[in-house]
């Protein structure tokens, strides 16, 4: 095997590598720095394996995980060394890592010449005390949030940020106002920000409006 | 290491145009906000706006709008700032800064900016 | 747009004296605010972030503190190499803007 890449996105996690296998299966182990290896998506002809209820477990740990080949047929295949062949993955930690999923506006309220949005707190696969976390409850004050708004009339664009998950910005009466949202980790030096939310124009189902 | 560096600055008459660039090594622009600010002599800081390199997401603020224009080049990682219809109030040092979201953490050392007949 | 009303635009102190600047924005900021300090010919440097967060490097000397629309930059012992000029910043929505300054000398 080789090209053993993590793709990871709000701590979903799935190690891919390459070839698709002809004559043989894989079989993947990962384990971190300090710990025993596990195996995982045994002697399978997928290129893929799913690792994502291995690393929740400890977001914050660096794992590695490695990728077995035993020819078909011959499971005890071995290397020169009486080993199976195996591939090593990059190391990978997932709250240093993983991909910020694009948000989602969960809705805007107007009242007067304010307006709240609400971003929706994602839910991620990370567990405490058997509940699953939301985004926010994994990343705390780690995570800001950028709100981009603009007249629906003109093109000049404003931005604010949070460390919640919601903004009270001003608007002009009798103006509609579009807006999108985008994910930050600002403690980060790669995969630091997610994809711009989609669009959401005040006039549209998600808004409420009082006087 | 991370560094920024403004450059195309000058001499100009009223009226006319200029454009500054701004090289980062060390990091991805793309990663990151980037911000132009200036300071005129003798004068504070005063922001001109800022943009996402990787959405072309720009902001200004109202003052320089359509004068000014913010842009980026990710292939070359550079910063640029378009300066249009140019006024001797436009007479500054022009930085450009990364932003991690929570404090402007790296400037460029400035390039001048001189607009006189 | 929210306006920074950053003062005493100038002070003189002596060394070991304790300083105090403030900004007061002209609506809540959330404490997106951040001080920065410019040497002549210098680009501005980065001292407190998210109001009270002392930047990586920077001497326990300084502090800040403050929330909504209140801020406060202290220097608790004056020392020579602090001469300079000090700008509060906000951030939490744009446009951004910048304190006036707070030219800093010694007696």
């Known amino acids: 095997a080789f090209n053993l890449t993590w793709i990871s996105t709000d701590f979903k996690t799935i190690l891919e590598w390459q070839p698709k296998p002809t004559n043989y299966t894989y079989t993947v182990q990962i384990s971190t720095k300090s710990g025993d290896w596990k195996s995982k998506c045994f002697y399978t002809t997928d290129t893929e394996c799913d690792l994502t209820d291995e690393i929740v477990k400890d977001v914050k740990q660096t794992y590695l995980a490695r990728v077995f080949s035993y020819p078909a047929g011959n499971v005890e295949s071995t290397g020169s060394a009486g080993e199976p062949l195996y591939e090593n993955s990059p190391e990978f930690t997932p709250y240093l890592e993983t991909n910020l999923g694009q948000p989602t506006i969960q809705s805007f309220e107007q009242v007067g010449t304010k307006v709240n949005v609400t971003v929706e707190d994602e839910r991620t696969l990370v567990r405490r005390n058997n509940t699953f976390l939301s985004l926010r409850d994994v990343f705390g004050k780690d995570l800001i949030y950028t709100l981009y708004y603009w007249k629906s009339s003109s093109s000049g664009k404003k931005t604010a940020k949070t460390n919640t998950n919601e903004f009270l910005i001003d608007v002009d009466k009798g103006e509609n106002y579009c807006f999108s949202v985008q994910a930050v980790i600002p403690s980060r030096t790669v995969n630091r920000k997610s994809t711009d939310s989609p669009v959401e124009c005040m006039g549209q189902e998600k808004g409420e409006f009082r006087e | 290491q991370v560094q920024l560096v403004e450059s195309g600055g000058g001499v100009v008459q009223p009226g006319r145009s200029l454009r500054l660039s701004c090289k980062a090594s060390?990091?991805?622009?793309?990663?990151?906000?980037m911000h132009w600010v200036r300071q005129a002599p003798g004068k504070g800081l005063e922001w001109i706006g800022l943009i996402d390199p990787e959405n072309g997401n720009t902001i200004y603020d109202p003052k320089f709008q359509g004068r000014f224009t913010i842009s980026a080049d990710n292939s070359k990682n550079t910063l640029f700032l378009q300066m249009d219809s140019l006024r001797p109030e436009d007479t500054a040092v022009y930085y450009c800064?990364?932003?991690?979201?929570?404090?402007?953490?790296?400037w460029g050392q400035g390039t001048p900016v001189t607009v006189s007949s | 747009d929210i306006q920074m009303t950053q003062s005493p635009s100038s002070l003189s102190a002596s060394v070991g004296d304790r300083v105090t600047i403030t900004c007061k924005a002209s609506q809540d900021i959330r404490k997106y605010l951040n001080w920065y300090q410019q040497k002549p010919g210098k680009a501005p440097k980065l001292l407190i972030y998210y109001a009270t967060s002392l930047a990586d490097g920077v001497p326990s000397r300084f502090s800040g503190s403050g929330s909504g629309t209140d801020y406060t930059f202290t220097i608790s012992s004056l020392q020579p190499e602090d001469i300079a000029t000090y700008y509060c910043l906000q951030h939490g929505e744009s446009p951004y803007t910048f304190g006036q300054g707070t030219k800093l000398e010694i007696t």
């Open positions: 060390g990091f991805n622009i793309k990663d990151y906000y």
């Open positions: 800064a990364r932003d991690n979201s929570y404090y402007f953490d790296y």
